[in-house]
């Protein structure tokens, strides 16, 4: 404890929850001679105190909303009050609790939206504030639409961003809103703190009135603009128009380009401001925005498409400074040596980028010029006149002209003459045996090393070996990487192995050269090898199709109604048995075979909704492995709870005799779901005979006043029956009794003679 709650004077930070204990000692600082006492300065707010002995404490509960951090300084003083140590900073961080409710900034909001506005684009924000810490759930607000009126075919036209309070259209709203059919809507919005996730969250509601207006704000047709235009800029290319005059137009470059060559004027005319370069960017998509005078968007942005038309302003380019090819000695005429692929930045598949190839020089011209030819359009080099001999000329250099319709470029090709590829790769083993792997072996694992050798000229295409799997792996689960120095092949796992689809694979490898074999030499059995891959089963648990299954039913559904279903599959193909776990209320049963879920008891939203249970899928046979998912049953409210008194009203009394008519206030409630702003109860006397003595009048949706009509009451208890109607569908009525006693009073309380048996009323009216 010594080190944790006491110690030397040094900078420290303490975190303390607000509103908790009214006082606590935080720490005891220990003085070193000649220090004998301590002094506290800074943001103490008369809450933080330090004792002479170094005890730092606070003397009343903290409030984060008043001050979230207290910056204090502690110094050690000697007997003369001189600072001998410090001052050192002491920081008190006040941690938040949820002690503030969210409040909408307005009790009513009004807004308008154009028909066909883009779904998801806010046209109105509701805003609530909560004094609690927004970095904690206490101050994290969650907005919801409680109801939309009217609601046509049960379709929501509006949605709210539950974090920002932004109201926008749904996809259906964007498509179906029509001012001719329905020009106005009302939404009731709720806000909760705790991110809406806690039963203990605080909430508030507000009302939103929305007008739907006609829309002429539409995207123009795509525009085509020739690149490198020499016309004077800016050039008008298209236009947009807002529905009403006075809009402020702007363009938004969603791509955040380093240069954005478009502008818009206050008429809505759109211009290109400088010549465009198709090779820099061949198309632009940007947005036209209309805002009101306060800079608030009036509607969704319009997408403007500009396509840049190509001109031939780029020469061909070579693939590299020198392109190297190999050709074997004694190769036959017409054999392909390689393809020179030049590039042109102009638009593909147009005359501007269509290339021609022509050999302009061969060096050396030994034994003659014109040994090579190039296909005019394809760029493929071929042997034209005769076979080559390495000892005569081991290397040729070609200059090739590549041209489009306006430009010419010279590219350089080096052709190395190599030994003939008359040796095939030979595997050191023809059979690499059996390999047994579990189906969950990691992707990327090297599972086998294979080796072939080739006696041709080293480090040429004649001796380089490429390994291919030619049989036994149609799924492409395996691959072979080759080490270019050693020609060693590493067999790796590229895709997960699967016992269920391929328990045994008979794999055949082929070893090949990138260079063609000399005429008359063919790959034979020596260039092939095999191995057998045996995959063992790893028993996997069944897999649910969803992590959470959700269903919605009315709380009054008949017993035996199907309320939902779940599905799972077993990777091994075993049958699955479904069961429920955590059905604490005994409301549900599941069909073990189909996964259908049925009600087996009356459901009750007021007991809690959604009702959450776990569903378990278990293999039938095998290892009986199982997996678990959630089933959430959302219960929709039915008006099935009559109104009742909100609290116990025994003990109401009037002092007898009444000097003037009196009254008392009572509150009603019920357990059903109340949209809008709470219940709307109506109140009346429970029987006609009471009307001579009593009167009941509504104060608001939940409170009413019971008044006496005269002063002539006997000294006894009266039981007044009150009828409370909830106005629901169907309307439910509760008859409640308010016991009211008229009694002799002493100092404002009922006087009871000794021995009186009934309870003494405690509330005077």
């Amino acid at each position: 404890q010594e080190g944790k709650f006491s110690g030397p004077l040094k900078p420290m930070t303490f975190s303390i929850y607000e509103g908790q204990e009214p006082s606590q000692i935080i720490f005891q600082f220990k003085a070193n001679p000649p220090a004998v006492t301590f002094e506290l300065t800074g943001e103490t707010d008369n809450i933080f105190v330090i004792e002479r002995e170094g005890l730092l404490y606070y003397n009343r509960a903290l409030d984060r909303e008043t001050r979230s951090t207290h910056n204090l300084q502690v110094a050690a003083l000697d007997a003369n009050g001189i600072i001998v140590e410090g001052p050192v900073p002491i920081t008190i961080k006040v941690k938040d609790i949820n002690d503030n409710r969210p409040t909408f900034l307005q009790s009513k909001y009004e807004g308008s939206v154009r028909q066909n506005s883009r779904p998801g684009k806010p046209f109105l924000y509701v805003n609530a504030t909560d004094l609690d810490d927004p970095a904690t759930p206490n101050g994290q607000l969650y907005y919801q639409i409680v109801i939309q009126l009217p609601m046509i075919n049960n379709v929501m036209y509006f949605q709210i961003n539950n974090k920002t309070g932004a109201i926008s259209l749904t996809r259906e709203g964007s498509q179906e809103l029509n001012p001719a059919k329905n020009p106005s809507y009302n939404l009731v919005i709720s806000v909760k703190d705790m991110g809406g996730q806690s039963e203990n969250s605080f909430s508030d509601t507000t009302s939103v009135d929305i007008i739907v207006t006609e829309n002429i704000w539409k995207a123009p047709k795509p525009v085509e603009m020739v690149e490198n235009s020499t016309d004077p800029h800016p050039i008008k290319i298209t236009q947009v128009r807002w529905n009403d005059p006075g809009a402020q137009y702007s363009l938004v470059d969603k791509e955040k380009l380093p240069r954005f060559p478009f502008s818009i004027d206050q008429e809505g005319d759109i211009y290109v401001t400088q010549p465009l370069d198709r090779e820099e960017k061949d198309a632009y998509v940007f947005y036209a925005v209309a805002k009101d005078e306060y800079g608030k968007p009036l509607s969704y942005p319009l997408e403007i498409h500009v396509k840049v038309k190509d001109i031939n302003d780029n020469p061909p380019t070579c693939p590299s400074p020198v392109t190297v090819f190999e050709v074997q000695e004694n190769e036959r005429l017409g054999n392909s040596i390689g393809t020179l692929t030049a590039h042109d930045r102009d638009e593909e598949n147009t005359a501007n980028s269509f290339l021609n190839y022509r050999i302009v020089e061969q060096t050396p011209k030994l034994p003659m010029d014109g040994l090579f030819l190039i296909q005019t359009y394809a760029g493929m080099l071929q042997l034209a006149k005769q076979s080559l001999k390495k000892q005569d000329t081991p290397q040729y250099n070609l200059t090739i002209e590549v041209s489009d319709k306006d430009f010419k470029t010279l590219c350089f090709v080096q052709i190395n003459v190599i030994d003939i590829n008359d040796q095939i790769p030979i595997f050191e083993k023809s059979d690499y045996g059996n390999l047994t792997l579990a189906e969950d072996t990691n992707i990327g694992s090297t599972i086998l090393t294979i080796q072939a050798t080739d006696a041709d000229e080293p480090f040429t295409g004649s001796s380089k070996i490429l390994y291919h799997i030619i049989k036994g792996d149609s799924e492409g689960r395996l691959g072979v990487d080759t080490d270019p120095h050693t020609n060693t092949g590493y067999v790796i796992i590229k895709k997960p192995l699967d016992f269920e689809t391929a328990a045994v694979s008979n794999i055949v490898f082929k070893a090949e050269n990138p260079e063609p074999l000399v005429f008359g030499v063919k790959y034979n059995a020596s260039s092939f090898a095999k191995f057998t891959l045996i995959v063992t089963d790893v028993n996997e648990a069944p897999q649910f199709s969803q992590h959470v299954f959700q269903a919605k039913v009315s709380e009054d559904v008949a017993i035996g109604t199907k309320v939902g279903n779940v599905t799972a599959k077993d990777p091994e193909g075993l049958d699955i048995s479904y069961s429920l776990r955590g059905d604490t209320r005994g409301w549900l049963k599941i069909d073990h075979v189909t996964g259908e879920i049925f009600s087996v008891a009356p459901l009750d939203r007021e007991a809690g909704s959604p009702y959450r249970v776990q569903v378990v899928a278990t293999e039938v046979g095998g290892s009986s492995l199982s997996s678990v998912s959630e089933f959430h049953l959302i219960l929709m409210d039915v008006n099935d709870n009559p109104p009742r008194l909100a609290k116990d009203y025994t003990g109401l009394f009037f002092c007898h005799p009444l000097s003037a008519p009196g009254s008392l206030i009572f509150e009603a409630t019920d357990d059903d779901q109340h949209l809008f702003r709470g219940p709307h109860f109506t109140f009346s006397l429970g029987s006609g005979s009471l009307q001579n003595d009593w009167e009941v009048s509504k104060i608001n949706g939940t409170h009413a006043r019971l008044s006496t009509r005269h002063t002539e009451f006997e000294e006894r208890e009266y039981v007044v029956l009150i009828r409370i109607n909830d106005g629901g569908r169907p309307p439910l009525e509760g008859i409640v009794s308010l016991p009211v006693t008229f009694c002799s009073c002493v100092e404002g309380s009922c006087f009871r003679p000794a021995g009186h048996q009934t309870g003494i009323p405690t509330v005077g009216m």
Epitope: Q1, K4, F5, Q20, E21, P22, S23, Q24, I25, N46, I47, V49, Y57, N59, R60
Partner: nanobody, 114 residues
Framework: EVQLLESGGGLVQPGGSLRLSCAAS????????MGWYRQAPGKEREFVAA???????WYADSVKGRATISRDNAKNTVYLQLNSLRPEDTAVYYC????????WGQGTQVTVSS
């Protein structure tokens, strides 16, 4: 305003033990830091021990190992157990609630003498 009433003091021989009690009325000890202080004749009042609502305790070096502070929130009482008493422990012992009124008791006399 809370009233703090100390009891349990008296005359005790050196080496003996004593348990002081501090009962609160008109207020609570629950949630508050509570402390014991003492004042010997002719000297300044000095800190003896303190306890938080959650349990951590502090002691003056002069009583460390011989004193134990504890609390019973249900009884609204704080205790100070003093063992191996010495003549220099003779003083009036005061109970304190660390609050914004800085509430103190009237004190109880402890005399250690043979």
């Amino acid at each position: 305003e809370v009233q703090l009433l100390e009891s349990g003091g008296g005359l005790v021989q050196p080496g003996g033990s004593l348990r002081l009690s501090c009962a609160a009325s008109g207020g609570t000890v629950s949630g508050y830091a509570m402390g014991w202080y003492r004042q010997a004749p002719g000297k300044e009042r000095e800190f003896v021990a303190a306890i938080n609502s959650g349990g951590p305790t502090w002691y003056a070096d002069s009583v460390k190992g011989r004193a134990t502070i504890s609390r019973d929130n249900a009884k609204n009482t704080v205790y100070l157990q003093l063992n191996s008493l010495r003549p220099e422990d003779t003083a009036v012992y005061y109970c304190r609630r660390y609050d914004d009124y800085d509430s103190w008791g009237q004190g109880t006399q402890v005399t250690v003498s043979s």
